[in-house]
């Protein structure tokens, strides 16, 4: 007799087999909180930016990405003091003079408002009001990020 | 009446509830090649270590961690061209002045026999015969991991 | 009891050498950007130096530069600010200081040391 | 380096008087500005961060306001205990830290 959890994942095998679909998060796990469709774990210690990536990495997860104004202020909701800065997955790239998220796309500069230089070395951190540009060997809080639901066809592309 | 995969997240989630599990990744992505217990994504482009640290990070994987020289071998095994190199999660620490994997172990000098110079700016790569160290900047393929079995109570240490 | 306390203050004279120490307790040492402030008799505050939780980074007032070094072992929860050439203008209370929490090199001093007093004279 | 003005460099008031002190930056520093008050022989003591952020166990009669150059600590009703020397330090991204010249708030 299986139990559900092994029955279950024959389930999601068949049905991984006939949609390429894969299980993804279907809530988020112990310590992470819900923001939408994503689930979003704010460290309690702190790290230079590229420690903080590795961290999140080592997690199975990404340094927080935001689509737009609206999810920026929705994060920030979470943060409970106005003096705290958290690193997201954002930083300057000098070869392309632009600021770009970890996983290779650009800022649209509509999208947050930073405050500091664009310069080498600089890397992108929210507190409760503002988003700010910061060495990135600074030593501050961050946050990873987990996609919650299961994406139809979601196929990696070629890395 | 419920799909086979909605009916698996009531599953799961009763199960979690119980023991604090989380579903965890059940079989490997499409595209992942599974090793034991570990999918892994063999990278086809190339990416200087702290943009393969990244491209993991935004797939939810980390850079490959080796536990053992037999790990390490199962995993040489899969590569199919000698010639090619692969980053892993293993970089110089200068402040520490040692091989530190990015989940923040240190490496065990019995692990891995390094070929090349253990100095600042230096990242560990792996071919079919041999571990190397490289130039953080230099533009390889990588590896990334994601853990395949649920483990039980899995709770992150307070990052 | 979350608390900073200095020592290694005294009178020295133009030209020697002096180590303030700094004990922290009741807090995660290791998580916070921590800084000597001093503060000559009469006068106003002035910031000496910081370093960074990890002590990969450290600044200092150029009026120290080359002076002075701070240091800081985690596993001891101490601060160090190793003192060398001393002038009779660095007569003054030396606070040990930690930032407010993750606020990274801005730097509010939410926590300070009682001080100790150095005193540089012939 | 940013320079700090306070002023007025020192203020005689009574209890239940409303004191503002005022913190001029030589150069914008968004709000990255703190207020600490200091007693004789002790260590200063945070009361104001990030502007107008109030620390934790400071009375509510203390508040902060401004951003870019001007900056402003005002005690609405003051109280025996506040009398002392007051700072306010810049706390930009890159050092030095400086802290204004201090104004010391008097019984009248």
């Known amino acids: 007799q299986k139990s559900s959890i092994e029955k279950c994942s024959v389930d999601i095998q068949q049905s991984r087999n006939k949609t390429t679909e894969r299980p993804g998060l279907l809530n988020c796990p112990i310590y992470w909180q819900q923001l939408r469709e994503k689930c979003l774990l704010f460290s309690h210690t702190v790290n230079p930016w590229n420690n903080s990536l590795a961290d999140c990495s080592t997690k199975e997860s990404s340094l927080l990405l935001i689509r737009d104004k609206d999810e920026l202020i929705h994060t920030q909701n979470l943060i409970r003091d106005k003096a705290i800065l958290f690193w997201i997955g954002l930083n300057f790239s000098l070869s392309e003079k632009n600021w770009k998220w970890i996983n290779g796309s650009f800022l649209n500069s509509n999208d947050l408002e930073i405050r500091g230089d664009a310069k080498e070395n600089s890397c992108i951190s929210i507190s409760q009001t503002s988003v700010y540009s910061e060495y990135c060997s600074t030593e501050i809080r961050w946050i990873c990020q987990k996609e919650l639901t299961p994406v139809r066809n979601k196929v990696y592309p070629d890395s | 009446q419920k799909s086979s995969i909605e009916k698996c997240s009531v599953d799961i989630q009763q199960s979690r509830n119980k023991t604090t599990e989380r579903p965890g990744l059940l079989n490997c992505p499409i595209y992942w090649q599974q090793l034991r217990e570990k999918c892994l994504l063999f990278s086809h482009t190339v990416n200087p270590w702290n943009n393969s640290l990244a491209d993991c990070s935004t797939k939810e994987s980390s850079l490959l961690l080796i536990r053992d020289k037999d790990e390490l071998i199962h995993t040489q095994n899969l590569i199919r061209d000698k010639a090619i190199l692969f980053w892993i999660g293993l970089n110089f620490s200068l402040s520490e002045k040692n091989w530190k994997w990015i989940n923040g172990s240190f490496l065990n000098s019995n692990d891995l026999e390094i070929r090349g110079d253990a100095k600042e700016n230096s990242c560990i790569s792996i071919s079919q015969t041999s571990v190397y160290s490289e130039y953080c900047s230099t533009e390889i393929r990588w590896i990334c991991q994601k853990e395949l079995t649920p483990v039980r109570n899995k709770v992150y240490p307070d990052s | 009891q979350v608390q900073l306390v200095e020592s290694g203050g005294g009178l020295v004279k133009p030209g020697g050498s002096l180590r303030l120490s700094c004990a922290a307790s009741g807090f995660t040492f290791s998580d916070y950007y921590m800084s000597w402030i001093r503060q000559a008799p009469g006068k106003g505050l002035e910031w000496v130096s910081y370093i960074s939780p990890s002590g990969a980074t450290i600044y200092y007032a150029d009026s120290v530069k080359g002076r002075f070094t701070i240091s800081r072992d985690n596993a001891k929860n101490s601060l160090y600010l190793q003192m060398n050439s001393l002038r009779a203008e660095d007569t003054a209370v030396y606070y040990c200081a930690r930032s407010l929490m993750s606020t990274g090199t801005h730097l509010y001093f939410d926590l300070w040391g009682r001080g100790t007093l150095v005193t540089v004279s012939s | 380096d940013i320079q700090l003005t306070q002023s007025p460099s020192s203020v005689s008031a009574s209890v239940g008087d409303r004191v503002t002190i005022t913190c001029r930056a030589s150069?914008?520093?968004?709000?990255?500005l703190a207020w600490y008050q200091q007693k004789p022989g002790k260590a200063p003591k945070l009361l104001i961060y990030a502007a107008s952020s109030l620390q934790s166990g400071v009375p509510s009669r203390f508040s902060g306001s401004g951003s870019g150059t001007d900056f402003t600590l005002t005690i609405s009703s003051l109280q025996p205990e506040d009398f002392a020397t007051y700072y306010c330090q810049q706390v930009t991204s890159v050092p030095p830290y400086t802290f204004g010249g201090g104004t010391k708030v008097e019984i009248k």
């Open positions: 150069q914008g520093i968004s709000s990255w």
